[in-house]
């Protein structure tokens, strides 16, 4: 016998579906309006067809009534090739649902995203993610996109994009984006970094998470936020393989005074990075290659510091005395 | 083991200079920054400043800023403190002493754990 | 510029009892506190560090304690090799850094 293709949890809170027959049958996610967090894994398919048995320009409006009464907060839809089309269709849908986050992973979305018609509302999230989700449109997709969700968005990740560069001129600005999270895209880099952080587009933003996106030296970063006039608090440049020492000719980048937290760990350093802000709420530098301390000017001064899993640290390697430098703390790094 | 082997006293008429020096040994050098404490004679102990011995870089407390010099010899493990223009108000014991960094769960911070012996700097006409 | 103010300045104890040394930060600074004992024609010597660490081999009559602003140095028998000066030292993250007067042990 073949596994139900869905799954509610005894609570009727979290639904999962996982659809790897050749031919679904969709009917059975209808178990999942009772949840509060649904997944749709769609094994790959290709909804292309779907697109002959919906109208993707049918009025909404005539399934606000019964959307509005669904529990769902959060979606996830994955692994599957979507047709713009029907994608917008079913963000026309969802946007009279309670729907606060929504997860794309694993998609292909194929076509360009017709505009939203004057009479449309937009979907009202404030948490999008996206991770490996590719667009047909190219570099003009989060500004097709962004057209079909109301402005109050507040957490937009987006992880191993193919283009993670965005249509600057395109993009409107997000103003009650706090948290943007472009980590796991390896390829970005430094200039990738300005390029996506479109000027003055990211007003509110207060938390950047660059882990794992090429960068190089914190200098740069600053160089990048900088350029776009992005004043983060809270910065993380973790699983980075960074350079400490700073090219003597390029300029000095002076941090913005509103960041209190950087994360600097995985990071593969040999020393404490040079140019960093001068005072810190939070300074994270553990499971770096530190081999020895820390001199006072190399520090900034910092408020809550961690630097455990460093070789200077590990017990066994040559400690001057017992208790200096040994917090017996040694995490897995 | 640890040492901090200072020069011997010296004796030094008003306007001229002096150069102190601080011996290392027992450890590496290059890992741990030095400082320079001043004694005035029945005087209490007074940070003068440190030296980076990774990048030679000194910082001077604000009243040490003029006259005084920190510069280091890496490979001789040496540290030195040279004073010019010599005044009645120099007249002091000098003290190198090592930095040694602490860190436990997110507390960190330096200390002072060896010493030198000091060298007696008199200005005299 | 923090200021590190000990007192007293000379506290005058019988060998055998405890003695209370004090030392006030002008601002706050954690737990980076640092003490130093010195002794007549010596260089002095770290006993606590970061306000309540016994170093290697300080015997384990000494003890200190505090944050923020007010510390303690306390010698809980004293000795008859425990008389000498005392010095506090903030050592708050980065530099500069002060000692405190110093405050005088003296045998009663």
């Known amino acids: 016998t073949t596994p139900e293709p869905c799954e509610l949890d005894d609570e009727d809170f979290r639904c999962v579906c996982n659809f790897s027959e050749p031919q679904p049958d969709w009917s059975e996610a209808f178990q999942c309006v009772s949840a509060v967090e649904v997944e749709i894994h769609a094994g790959g398919l290709n909804l292309e067809p779907f697109l002959k048995r919906v109208d993707a320009d049918a009025d909404p409006r005539q399934y606000a009534d019964t959307v509005k009464a669904l529990r769902v907060r959060r979606l996830t839809v994955g692994a599957a090739q979507v047709p713009a089309q029907l994608l917008v269709g079913a963000l026309r849908v969802l946007a009279y649902s309670r729907l606060k986050e929504l997860t794309l992973e694993d998609l292909k979305i194929t076509g360009t995203m017709p505009p939203l018609p004057l009479e449309a509302t937009g979907l009202a999230l404030s948490s999008l993610r996206l991770r490996n989700v590719s667009w047909a449109t190219g570099r003009s997709w989060l500004a097709e996109l962004q057209q079909w969700l109301k402005p109050g968005l507040k957490v937009l990740s987006i992880a191993q994009a193919h283009s993670p560069a965005f249509s600057c001129e395109q993009v409107r600005a997000f103003p009650a984006l706090t948290s943007l999270d472009l980590s796991d895209n390896p390829g970005l880099g430094e200039r990738g970094l300005m390029a996506a952080l479109c000027p003055h587009k990211f007003p509110a933003i207060q938390n950047l998470a660059l882990r794992n996106t090429g960068m190089e030296t914190p200098t740069g970063v600053c160089a990048a936020l900088a350029a776009a006039g992005v004043q983060p608090h809270s910065l993380d440049l973790s699983h980075n393989s960074l350079r400490a020492t700073v090219n003597p000719s390029a300029p000095r980048c002076m941090w913005s005074s509103a960041l209190n937290s950087l994360n600097l760990s995985f990071a593969g350093l040999e020393q404490v990075p040079k140019g960093l802000p001068a005072k810190l709420r939070v300074l994270d530098l553990s499971c770096n290659r530190l081999n020895r301390a820390p001199q006072p000017d190399e520090l900034p001064e910092v408020d809550n510091l961690t630097l455990d899993g460093n070789p200077f640290l590990v017990p066994g390697t040559a400690l001057p005395h017992e208790g200096s430098m040994n917090s017996g703390v040694v995490p897995a790094c | 083991q640890v040492q901090l082997v200072q020069s011997g006293h010296e004796v030094k008429q008003p306007g001229a200079s002096v150069k102190v020096s601080c011996k290392a040994s027992?450890?590496?050098?290059?890992?741990?920054?030095m400082n320079w404490v001043k004694q005035a004679p029945g005087q209490g102990l007074e940070w003068m400043g440190w030296?980076?011995?990774?990048?030679?870089?000194?910082t001077y407390a604000d009243d040490f800023k003029q006259r005084f010099v920190f510069s280091m010899d890496t490979s001789a493990s040496t540290a030195y403190l040279q004073i010019s223009s010599l005044k009645a108000e120099d007249m002091a014991m000098y003290y190198c002493?090592?930095?040694?960094?602490?860190?436990?769960?997110?507390?960190?911070?330096?200390?002072?754990?060896?010493w030198g012996q000091g060298t007696s700097v008199t200005v005299s006409s | 510029e923090i200021v590190m103010t000990q007192s007293p300045a000379t506290l005058s104890v019988s060998p055998g009892e405890r003695a209370t040394l004090s030392c006030k930060a002008s601002?706050?600074?954690?737990?980076?506190v640092d003490w130093y004992q010195q002794k007549p024609g010596q260089a002095p010597r770290l006993l606590i560090y970061k306000a309540s660490n016994r170093y290697t081999g300080i015997p384990a009559r000494f003890s200190g304690s505090g944050s923020g602003t007010e510390f303690t140095l306390t010698i809980s028998s004293l000795q008859s090799e425990d008389f000498a000066v005392y010095y506090c030292m903030q050592s708050n993250t980065n530099p500069p850094w002060t000692f405190g007067q110093g405050t005088k042990v003296e045998i009663k």
């Open positions: 030296i980076n011995t990774q990048t030679g870089k000194p």
């Open positions: 601002q706050n600074v954690g737990s980076n």
């Open positions: 027992g450890y590496s050098f290059t890992d741990y920054a």
């Open positions: 002493a090592r930095s040694t960094f602490y860190y436990s769960s997110y507390i960190y911070g330096w200390y002072f754990d060896f």
